[in-house]
């Protein structure tokens, strides 16, 4: 479809409300430090221009590409050099290099304050100007999550609006809002991590890797859909995510709406679980489709061995049509295994490929590849046993101590990584236990390894910004499917020189007493990571004792009248006894 004016086309397709929201998100993801008011001004100017083009597509500049129009607009920001430094150099470039330049300057860890719910002030702002209030939410989330899936953020903004609509008239706004906003924050973090993994996959492994991931996942979700149907959805969905990852949020949202329409029109041949989704309005419909539960397996699925281990024509197909042949294997295997993680399915497909590569060069290929399915058994057993071991530990000690075990584990693997990053990753991995270990056996593995992939990608993204460990770089860049096994295989870094002991690292003050529980935990967990960096060979028992002593010390001093005096007096004693315990 060629349109005289791309901006008019998208404005007409999306409507003013969604158009404005997506432009605001896109701009906030590029210029993460700009004040909200500056972004609103830019968005209003772009929207007025889009309206002009919608009225007359041949008006001046309406034929320009969206990258040109948006890039030109971003480059008008007066404080660009002062606020962003070398990002301003992007403005010297021509498209498409300019947009690529903007993308490379997106900051996954911007130095922005934590957003604290303030029900009274927020309700007043919401009631005074709902559109501005929701715009501010889009802006605040987008600038903290520069790869957030644009159209999905519009959906979450509707949830946010619904929460305030319900809670602001309530007698106890705080009691009504806090649990809702906490739950929304968790969904936002999960959604952000999912899209970041897709964008990282494009950046580091290419479109083929994203397509393979999607073939596996969609075949699990839609086991009755035929290969052509899955191929069509994968192709369209890959385009959608490629656009969003490249900052082309208008095209992305438009194509996503088209895909949702297609899926709903053909739901009979895709999945029986789509009915409830397809009755909803656009944003809810797309979200619902993305999160839809796996359909029941068709009862008549034949065993795979006949076609993929016994057929004489396998090598002909492998040699002459490698990609599509392996694609059909991945589709057929995945649709039969909703109980496997995506990365496990990709590892199985990789093993199948390696076997054919070897066997098809031999004198008697069929005899060689006949036992290929036996080679999948150890691939499946390894993560299953890992999940069992970790869920057993989680059930024994609970979330907080499970997080601590993971912080210790990952600090030993990569002690060079910053403490805040190790604590964040350890805490996220620990929460996977709470999410997945309560599930039925058949759902534990996919839940655990799929969520682990998100947490490890976060580690890779943060490490890419400031690389400190060759072993982490290797795990992050070698293979998407092998990431988790690669990290699992990392042992204590023997080349690491233990960090010098600094008493101030372990010095606590009375301010810890007034912190919310999760921030208190983070303080203690930071100390734990620092202890491991100081004594990487400390035993579990030693660390448990020292951390227990720290917790008791904090509880004791926080219960005292003169808290600060207690911290000042007892702190050095604790530090000394801890050093002794770890000697």
């Amino acid at each position: 479809d060629t349109h005289k004016s791309e901006i008019a086309h998208r404005f007409n397709d999306l409507g003013e409300k969604h158009f404005k929201g997506l432009v605001l998100v896109a701009f906030s993801q590029y210029l993460q430090q700009c004040p909200f008011e500056d972004h609103v001004k830019l968005v209003n100017e772009v929207t007025e221009f889009a309206k002009k083009c919608a009225a007359d597509e041949s008006a001046e500049n309406c034929d320009k590409s969206l990258h040109t129009l948006f890039g030109d607009k971003l480059c008008t920001v007066a404080t660009l050099r002062a606020t962003y430094g070398e990002l301003a150099d992007c403005c010297e470039k021509q498209e498409p290099e300019r947009n690529e330049c903007f993308l490379t300057h997106k900051d996954d860890h911007p130095n922005l304050p934590k957003l604290k719910p303030e029900p009274d002030a927020q309700c007043a702002a919401f009631q005074e100007d709902p559109d501005k209030f929701l715009g501010k939410y889009l802006y605040e989330v987008a600038r903290r999550h520069p790869y957030f899936y644009g159209p999905e953020l519009l959906f979450h903004a509707e949830e946010y609006k619904a929460d305030f609509t319900e809670c602001c008239p309530a007698d106890d706004k705080l009691a009504c809002l806090i649990p809702k906003l906490d739950a929304l924050k968790e969904r936002i973090l999960l959604s952000s991590a999912k899209e970041r993994l897709k964008c990282s996959s494009f950046q580091n492994f290419g479109e083929r890797a994203v397509k393979a991931w999607s073939v596996a996942r969609l075949s699990q979700k839609f086991p009755k859909a035929d290969f052509a149907e899955v191929s069509k959805i994968v192709t369209d969905l890959t385009k959608v995510h490629k656009e969003c990852c490249h900052g082309d949020l208008l095209e992305c949202a438009d194509d996503r709406a088209d895909l949702a329409k297609y899926i709903c029109e053909h739901q009979d041949s895709i999945s029986g679980k789509l009915k409830a989704c397809c009755d909803k309005p656009l944003l809810q419909k797309s979200h619902c489709i993305a999160e839809v539960k796996e359909d029941d397996l068709p009862s008549d699925l034949p065993a795979l061995a006949a076609d993929f281990a016994e057929d004489k024509e396998i090598c002909k197909h492998y040699k002459d049509a490698k990609d599509v042949f392996l694609g059909t294997f991945l589709y057929e295997y995945s649709r039969r295994h909703p109980d496997y993680s995506v990365s496990l399915l990709l590892r199985i497909a990789k093993t199948y490929e390696a076997t054919l590569e070897k066997c098809c060069a031999e004198a008697d290929p069929p005899a060689c590849y006949r036992t290929v399915f036996d080679q999948f058994t150890p691939l499946v057993e390894e993560p299953k046993s890992l999940v069992k071991k970790n869920c057993d530990l989680f059930e024994e000690v609970g979330e907080y101590d499970f997080q601590n075990a993971l912080i210790v584990r990952y600090t030993k693997k990569a002690p060079q990584v910053s403490t805040p990053t190790l604590v964040e990753i350890g805490r996220t991995l620990g929460k996977v236990g709470s999410r997945c270990c309560k599930l039925p056996e058949s759902e534990r593995l996919p839940c655990s390894e799929n969520h682990l992939a998100l947490a490890l990608n976060r580690l890779c993204v943060l490490h890419e910004k400031t690389p400190v460990s060759e072993k982490i770089t290797k795990c992050c860049t070698d293979s998407l499917a092998e990431r988790r096994p690669c990290f699992s295989a990392l042992e204590l870094d023997e080349g690491y020189v233990p960090k010098e002991f600094k008493a101030e690292t372990f010095t606590f003050h009375a301010d810890i007493c007034t912190l919310p529980e999760d921030e208190k935990q983070i303080k203690k967990q930071s100390a734990l990571a620092e202890l491991v960096k100081h004594k990487p060979k400390a035993t579990k028992e030693q660390l448990k004792t020292v951390l227990g002593n720290f917790s008791a010390f904090v509880a004791k001093c926080c219960g005292r009248e003169d808290k600060e005096a207690c911290f000042a007096e007892e702190g050095p004693k604790l530090v000394a006894s801890s050093q002794l315990a770890l000697a």
């Epitope: 149907e229 049509a321 599509v324 694609g327």
Partner: nanobody, 120 residues
Amino acid sequence: QVQLQQSGGGLVQAGDSLRLSCAASGRAFNYYTMGWFRQAPGKEREFVAKIYWDGGSTIYADSVKGRFTISIDNAKNTVYLQMNSLKPEDTAVYYCAADPSFYPFRPKYWGQGTQVTVSS
């Protein structure tokens, strides 16, 4: 549902060329694998060639490799079989076929068939 309409075929001399066409209609055709089969008198229907929708992957029967070329035009929703260096043993009714799966290729949809006769 996919409908397949064949054209081409006829009587030619050994060594000549012929092109068969098969126009498809119906949804998601672009994601189907298209192929050609043939059935000689008194024999079973046999596989000739197939092509994946993106045009990048093709498989041929050993008996036609190097002489026949399968191609696809997604804009026209049409698949072609270019047959060169024809031999009398290529004489058969040729069927266009379509299936959602590239492998195993067990066609769900068939064209009406078209006669190709190669005289010596």
